[in-house]
Interface confidence: low
């Protein structure tokens, strides 16, 4: 299953990056799972994941750095709290969980660049 | 003449970006001219230029946004005062001016990404 996502995104100076993950659904899925993976060097780690019912809101865990909304076959993902050390390739993985058959699609990754802001001067 | 420069550089949150421009000199040049060009969309504009004698300091115009140092066939370039709208491809052009023969080399460009910082809160 094909998954499309932008090649490059710049995080805001507040450490927030948003991108769209779009999948070409071969069937009429009602339950979809979206996972964001981060690849840096040769290490791949899971950043966040959410399962949602089509037409409903994405719900990430309360302590997740991700939030998102869905619209049809598009998922709008936002990752917050990013620092320069979090710069890396963020891969969108989409699974069509229900009804069968199960489909898996993995995007090519969005390179997110993050720059740490300068601290504000102390107010006297 | 081959000119090498990094593919991507992130400007600091203060709007400062530095990169090295290295050229493979076919001869023993004593006078070298370095020009930084910015390409955005299909427009190419000159950002700054400096001519220097090998072993001496690079001298840009007083109001230039560029500064630099040279060491052998390497030029360390710093561009300051960058804003998000200045994001673009910065191309290093090197000319060996003296003695003859004249050589021209153009790098593949360094994509400089610039993110505007959030304003600091007013101090009461």
């Amino acid at each position: 299953m094909h998954v499309a996502q932008p090649a490059v995104v710049l995080a805001s100076s507040r450490g927030i990056a948003s991108f769209v993950c779009e999948y070409a659904s071969p069937g009429k899925a009602t339950e979809v799972r979206v996972t964001v993976l981060r690849q840096a060097d040769s290490q791949v780690t899971e950043v966040c994941a959410a399962t949602y019912m089509m037409g409903n809101e994405l719900t990430f865990l309360d302590d997740s750095i991700c939030t998102g909304t869905s619209s049809g076959n598009q998922v709008n993902l936002t990752i917050q709290g990013l620092r320069a050390m979090d710069t890396g390739l963020y891969i969108c993985k989409v699974e069509l969980m229900y009804p069968p058959p199960y489909y898996l699609g993995i995007g090519n990754g969005t390179q997110i660049y993050v720059i740490d802001p300068e601290p504000c001067p102390d107010s006297d | 003449m081959h000119v090498a420069q990094p593919a991507v550089v992130l400007a600091s949150s203060r709007g400062i970006a530095s990169f090295v421009c290295e050229y493979a000199s076919p001869g023993k040049a004593t006078e070298v001219r370095v020009t930084v060009l910015r390409q955005a969309d299909s427009q190419v504009t000159e950002v700054c230029a400096a001519t220097y004698m090998m072993g001496n300091e690079l001298t840009f115009l007083d109001d230039s946004i560029c500064t630099g140092t040279s060491s052998g066939n390497q030029v360390n370039l710093t561009i300051q005062g960058l804003r998000a709208m200045d994001t673009g491809l910065y191309i290093c052009k090197v000319e060996l001016m003296y003695p003859p023969p004249y050589y021209l080399g153009i790098g593949n460009g360094t994509q400089i990404y610039v993110i505007d910082p959030e304003p600091c809160p007013d101090s009461d």
Partner: nanobody
Framework: QVQLQESGGGSVQAGGSLRLSCAAS????????MAWFRQVPEKERERVAS????????YYADSVKGRFTISLDNAKNTLYLQMNSLKPEDTAMYYC??????????????????WGQGTQVTVSS
């Protein structure tokens, strides 16, 4: 480290054909841009053709449209440039380049971070 190795250059008469190959190794991103450039001494490198794997988007310089075809064999990780109806003005050193950047525009394609050593093409009249 990315390695790019061009081959297939040579000498040919005007009207003839050549097929250039560029073998790539050591690249970790699955979405990337690959392009062919050419350069004659002391002139700026010119993009001839490019392809973006994220959507198969291709680009051709006006001077080669209808004569040159760019293609990519993902299984072999090899880029090709089929050059037909060659002209003397096609004489140049041909380079292939690769990057994680998109290549939907000239601005994007110039982000290409990795270059091969080049293969010489000479077309005589």
């Amino acid at each position: 480290q990315v390695q790019l190795q061009e081959s297939g250059g040579g000498s040919v008469q005007a009207g003839g054909s050549l097929r250039l190959s560029c073998a790539a190794s050591g690249y970790t991103y699955s979405t990337y841009c690959m392009a062919w450039f050419r350069q004659v001494p002391e002139k700026e490198r010119e993009r001839v053709a490019s392809i973006y794997t994220g959507g198969g988007t291709t680009y051709y310089a006006d001077s080669v449209k209808g004569r040159f075809t760019i293609s990519l064999d993902n299984a072999k990780n090899t880029l090709y440039l089929q050059m037909n109806s060659l002209k003397p003005e096609d004489t140049a050193m041909y380079y292939c380049a690769k990057s994680a950047a998109r290549c939907d525009s000239s601005r994007d394609v110039n982000r290409l971070g990795y270059w091969g050593q080049g293969t010489q093409v000479t077309v005589s009249s």
